[in-house]
């Protein structure tokens, strides 16, 4: 699980305390620490909302929280894309948007988030317990997908709190390639730091230049992300029970949100971020079935004054050929 921790500044050893070999040994931890701090497991969050005014009208919002550049976003329903799901929309950063009924309006909200409005009538309209999935293809992380649906039963008079329930998926090429190397590097770094801990020379001490130590990110792989390597998808119940719509408030009460981060969700910062939408709950979960979620990891608190958010601005990715990835 990824956590935010205050790390004391690393002070270089005093000259002459270690030989050339020791100096080389210290360069590697610095490089690895830089990698560990700047690169992390990407995340996808999904929010599904049923409009109270249009009982079968849905708004799906998805976001990608990673350092890579997005090359394509695919929104599907009835399960993950490529695993029985039906594509609703494909959003290419440069070329535009393709959408299929009952998708009514898909658009890029920011450089890392999209929204999709679904038609509220007709035979192909969604029902309350439909599973919606967002798949982000990015470089170098690979493809990451999260799925979610509205809670099976919602009190029409109350606004349901965000319910974390992602389905994690990472293409092995992406996660095993880059993340594997980084994971090994981080473990090795910890090993080196531990070894140095017992020596008098390179020591960890508070920075002398600043009263407050710089903040850095440190993490270990979550159980959920490990599970993603072994179990491609969790089982999803996609049966449509129209009766679930009966719980909706007929006179326009609050909307219900299901907020689904795949790891600890760092919200995109800046004016483009959605201030009006709830911040997804942070934590790692594996979806067992619609409405039944087994927690797979400790849930850290929401971002507070003691934690730092790392904004993740990135530019558009160049077009990948005429058809892109379709």
């Amino acid at each position: 699980m990824r956590t935010e921790a205050q790390v004391p500044a690393l002070q270089p050893p005093e000259p002459g305390l270690e030989g050339a070999m020791g100096h080389r040994t210290l360069v590697l931890p610095w490089v690895l620490l830089t990698l560990c701090v700047t690169a992390g497991t990407p995340e996808v969050w999904v929010q599904v909302r049923m409009e109270a005014t249009e009982l079968s009208s849905f708004t799906i919002r998805c976001g990608f929280l990673g350092s890579g550049s997005i090359s394509l976003v695919t929104v599907s329903w009835g399960g993950p894309n490529g695993a029985g799901g039906t594509t609703l929309a494909v959003l290419h950063p440069e070329r535009g948007i393709r959408q299929w009924a009952p998708a009514r309006q898909a658009r890029w909200e920011t450089q890392s988030s999209i929204s999709l409005i679904l038609e509220g009538s007709g035979a192909s309209s969604p029902c309350a317990n439909t599973t919606f999935c967002c798949k982000f293809a990015s470089f170098p992380e690979g493809s990451w997908e999260a799925c979610g649906s509205l809670p099976p039963s919602s009190d029409p008079g109350l606004s349901a709190p965000p319910t974390p329930a992602p389905i994690l998926r990472a293409d092995l090429a992406g996660i095993l390639g880059v993340s594997g190397v980084l994971l090994f590097g981080c473990v090795y770094l910890l090993h080196l730091l531990r070894r140095h801990k017992h020596r008098p020379a390179p020591r960890l001490q508070p920075s002398r230049t600043s009263p407050q130590a710089p903040r850095a990110r440190a993490w270990a792989p979550s159980q959920a992300s490990q599970a993603a390597l072994h179990v491609p998808y969790a089982t999803i119940n996609t049966s449509c029970r129209p009766a679930t719509l009966d719980t909706a408030h007929p006179h326009g009460g609050p909307s219900w949100w299901a907020s689904l981060p795949t790891h600890a969700a760092h919200r995109p910062q800046g004016p483009a971020a959605w201030a009006s939408t709830p911040i997804p709950a942070r934590g790692s979960f594996v979806s067992v079935e619609n409405g039944l979620y087994a927690q797979a990891g400790e849930r850290p608190p929401h971002t507070g004054p003691g934690l730092t958010l790392f904004p993740d601005p990135r530019g558009p990715r160049a077009m990948e050929g005429p058809l892109g990835v379709r």
Epitope: H92, G96, I97, Q99, Q105, E109, Q111, L323, R326
Partner: antibody, heavy 120, light 113 residues
Framework: EVQLQQSGPELVKPGTSVKISCKAS????????MNWVRQSHEKSLEWIGE????????NYNQNFKAKATLTVDKSSNTAYMELRSLTSEDSAVFYC?????????????WGQGTSVTVSS | DIVMTQSPSSLAVSVGQKVTMSCKSS????????????LAWYQQKPGQSPKLLVY???TRESGVPDRFIGSGSGTDFTLTITSVQAEDLADYFC?????????FGGGTKLEIN
Amino acid sequence: EVQLQQSGPELVKPGTSVKISCKASGYTFTDYYMNWVRQSHEKSLEWIGEINPKNGDTNYNQNFKAKATLTVDKSSNTAYMELRSLTSEDSAVFYCAREGVSSYYGMDSWGQGTSVTVSS
Amino acid sequence: DIVMTQSPSSLAVSVGQKVTMSCKSSQSLLNGFNQKNFLAWYQQKPGQSPKLLVYFASTRESGVPDRFIGSGSGTDFTLTITSVQAEDLADYFCQQHHSTPPTFGGGTKLEIN
């Protein structure tokens, strides 16, 4: 040079079907979606739908889903549109248009058009 | 569907004059990722098929004379012909290429005095 050559004009009777063709040349046929557009005096230009020649996937304007069927023959680099249950209101000029290089729905090359007249 | 509205429906100008035509969309055509407006302009000369002039609201298609200038953002767009030539006699259509289904405006007929 990109060229889209459409079949000739059609005069058909109400209730029947017609299949018009669009032969592509000058580019890799499977690299670009093929769009079909209808032009009538009353309704200007209307997008009917598109087909991905690579795998045959289609995307229709809901207004034409019951009227048009899009297909391709990769071996001859040809796209087809069949129009069924024709009425006099279906009389129009139909164009095939290649999707643009830069955008999903910008259409950078058009066929010369096929006139379909429905009359008894 | 996104509704495209063009005005005027027709206009007559003399050769060498500057002309502007308007196109409005019922929704913003701005792509939030790359800040491009997904709007195209087409020219259709009498008896011919449409020809792409401008895409992304202001990017001129290769081979199109530089007297054709597309501008605007969000929901309001304009095609300007800085110095009209006799061969510019045609119908001009705007089209949103933002999302399905792509939709066209009703057209502006340009006539030469």
